[in-house]
C-alpha cells in the first residue's frame, strides 16, 4: 500500500476494490463485554466509493445501539465502544460506486466476563543482578478483570531475625497501587546497596482472590559486573 493517499486519475474509472486485505483477514471477533471493537474495509475506486454498514443484513442505524457507533470514512472503519451482548451478530460493509459494489462480513461475538482471581504472567518478575550503585527494575504483568491491588513486598530482618515470634516472616511493603503510585506493575530500585539483595514478591489481589510471584535480586560488588550482555530492557514475552 502506498504510504500516502494519491487521487486517482479522473479518466481511470474503476469499480471498488479492497486496498488492504490484511486488515480484513480476521472475520470472527470474540470481544469481552465493555471493550471497543473496530471493523475495517479499506477500499479504493474511481470515483471514490461510499461505504455503508449492515447488521445481520439490515441497515445499521445509530439508534440500533445504546451510544451509537462511529464511522470514519477516511479510514473505512466502524467503531463500537463498550460492546454489550446485544451487539452480537454479523456486520457487513458495503462499498460501492457507479461501477460496482463489493462487501465483506465480520462476525462479532461478545464474551461475558467471568470474574477470576488475578493471573500473573509466568516468568515475571524475573531474577535480576546488578552492581552496588546500579539500578534495577522488576516487572509484574497482571491480568485481572476486577480492579487489582498490586503490592511489592520484600522479606526484611528485624533485630537480626527474618521471622517474628509467631514464626511468620517480617515483610515490608515497598510499593502498592493507589492514587499516588504510577505504574504499580513496575518496581524500580535505584542506587542499590548490598542490603537490597534478596527476594521481591509481587502480590496481586482482587475481590475474588490473590496471586503472587517472586524474583531474586543479586547485588554484586562494584568491581564484579553481571555476566550478561549490555542490554537495557523491560521483559517482554
Amino acid at each position: 500500500m502506498a504510504e500516502d493517499f494519491v487521487s486517482e486519475n479522473s479518466n481511470n474509472k474503476r469499480a471498488p476494490y479492497w486496498t488492504n486485505t490484511e486488515k480484513m483477514e480476521k472475520r470472527l471477533h470474540a470481544v469481552p463485554a465493555a471493550n471497543t471493537v473496530k471493523f475495517r474495509c479499506p477500499a479504493g475506486g474511481n470515483p471514490m466509493p461510499t461505504m455503508r454498514w449492515l447488521k445481520n443484513g439490515k441497515e445499521f442505524k445509530q439508534e440500533h445501539r445504546i451510544g451509537g457507533y462511529k464511522v470514519r470514512n477516511q479510514h473505512w472503519s466502524l467503531i463500537m465502544e463498550s460492546v454489550v451482548p446485544s451487539d452480537k451478530g454479523n456486520y457487513t460493509c458495503v462499498v460501492e460506486n457507479e461501477y460496482g459494489s463489493i462487501n465483506h462480513t465480520y462476525h462479532l461475538d461478545v464474551v461475558e466476563r467471568s470474574p477470576h482471581r488475578p493471573i500473573l504472567q509466568a516468568g515475571l518478575p524475573a531474577n535480576a543482578s546488578t552492581v552496588v550503585g546500579g539500578d534495577v527494575e522488576f516487572v509484574c504483568k497482571v491480568y485481572s478483570d476486577a480492579q487489582p491491588h498490586i503490592q511489592w513486598i520484600k522479606h526484611v530482618e528485624k533485630n537480626g531475625s527474618k521471622y517474628g515470634p509467631d514464626g511468620l516472616p517480617y515483610l515490608k511493603v515497598l510499593k502498592h497501587s493507589g492514587i499516588n503510585s504510577s505504574n504499580a506493575e513496575v518496581l524500580a530500585l535505584f542506587n542499590v546497596t548490598e542490603a537490597d539483595a534478596g527476594e521481591y514478591i509481587c502480590k496481586v489481589s482482587n475481590y475474588i482472590g490473590q496471586a503472587n510471584q517472586s524474583a531474586w535480586l543479586t547485588v554484586l560488588p562494584k568491581q564484579q559486573a553481571p555476566g550478561r550482555e549490555k542490554e537495557h530492557h523491560h521483559h517482554h514475552h
Epitope: 500500500m1 471497543t36 470514512n73 477516511q74 479510514h75 467503531i79
Partner: antibody, heavy 119, light 107 residues
Framework: QVQLLESGGGLVQPGGSLRLSCAAS????????MSWVRQAPGKGLEWVSV????????HYADSVKGRFTISRDNSKNTLYLQMNSLRAEDTAVYYC????????????WGQGTLVTVSS | DIQMTQSPSSLSASVGDRVTITCRAS??????LNWYQQKPGKAPKLLIY???NLQSGVPSRFSGSGSGTDFTLTISSLQPEDFAVYYC?????????FGQGTKVEIK
C-alpha cells in the same frame, strides 16, 4: 514541503475562551484528517480531538468534551480549536498534527502554541 | 477509554546499547499502535506506525513489533541523538490515547 503553523495561544482567565488556529501548507488539506494534541508543562502527550478531512467526523477526549470544538475551513487550509470554559488543567502547549492516510499516525506536527489558564 | 501503559518510565543507557521499550494496551488493539520520539522543546516525531512500519526518513535502527495488547519499540544500537522521551499511542478506539512516556537518558 508540509508545514503546520499554530497560533492563537496566550494567557486567559479560568472560565474564559480562546480560539486556536493551525495554518496548513504543502499538501492537499481536505484529503487529511487533522488532530489537536496537547502537552502540559513537564507532562506527557494528551490527544484532544480529531476531525475528518471533509469535516464529517469529529471526536473529543473526555476531558474536553462539551467545552472544546474542532472545526476546519478547507478553502483556507486552516484547522481550528474553539476552547470555552477553560480550566487551569487546560494549560499546555497545543499542537496540531496531520494524520497519515489510512492510519491515525501523526506524521507532521506544528511547533505548538502555549495556552496558559491562570487568574 | 483504552489505557496505554509504558515500561519502563525511564532508563539509563550508553551509546551502542540495545534498548527495548514496551507498551501494553488495556484491551486488544490489533496493530493500531504508533511510536513517537520527542526531544525537549520540540514537537514529537513519528517513528513507527501500525506497530511495525518504519516511517519514511527514520533510521533503520528503530523497529517496532507486537499486536493485540503487547508492543515493543527497539533501538538496536543507541546513538547520541536518540536520548529523548518515547511515547506509544493507540488509534484503535476513537480517543487516540498515548502512553505516559519513557525517558531514555545517558548513563
Amino acid at each position: 514541503q508540509v508545514q503546520l503553523l499554530e497560533s492563537g495561544g496566550g494567557l486567559v482567565q479560568p472560565g474564559g475562551s480562546l480560539r486556536l488556529s493551525c495554518a496548513a501548507s504543502g499538501f492537499t488539506f481536505s484529503d487529511y484528517a487533522m488532530s489537536w494534541v496537547r502537552q502540559a508543562p513537564g507532562k506527557g502527550l494528551e490527544w484532544v480531538s480529531v476531525i475528518e478531512g471533509d469535516g464529517s467526523y469529529t471526536h473529543y477526549a473526555d476531558s474536553v468534551k462539551g467545552r472544546f470544538t474542532i472545526s476546519r475551513d478547507n478553502s483556507k487550509n486552516t484547522l481550528y480549536l474553539q476552547m470555552n470554559s477553560l480550566r487551569a488543567e487546560d494549560t499546555a502547549v497545543y499542537y496540531c498534527a496531520r494524520e497519515k492516510t489510512y492510519s491515525s499516525a501523526f506524521d507532521y506536527w506544528g511547533q505548538g502554541t502555549l495556552v496558559t489558564v491562570s487568574s | 477509554d483504552i489505557q496505554m501503559t509504558q515500561s519502563p518510565s525511564s532508563l539509563s543507557a550508553s551509546v551502542g546499547d540495545r534498548v527495548t521499550i514496551t507498551c501494553r494496551a488495556s484491551q486488544d488493539i490489533s496493530s493500531d499502535l504508533n511510536w513517537y520520539q520527542q526531544k525537549p522543546g520540540k514537537a514529537p516525531k513519528l517513528l513507527i506506525y501500525d506497530a511495525s512500519n518504519l516511517q519514511s526518513g527514520v533510521p533503520s535502527r528503530f523497529s517496532g513489533s507486537g499486536s493485540g495488547t503487547d508492543f515493543t519499540l527497539t533501538i538496536s544500537s543507541l546513538q547520541p541523538e536518540d536520548f529523548a522521551v518515547y511515547y506509544c499511542q493507540q488509534h484503535y478506539s476513537p480517543s487516540h490515547t498515548f502512553g505516559q512516556g519513557t525517558k531514555v537518558e545517558i548513563k
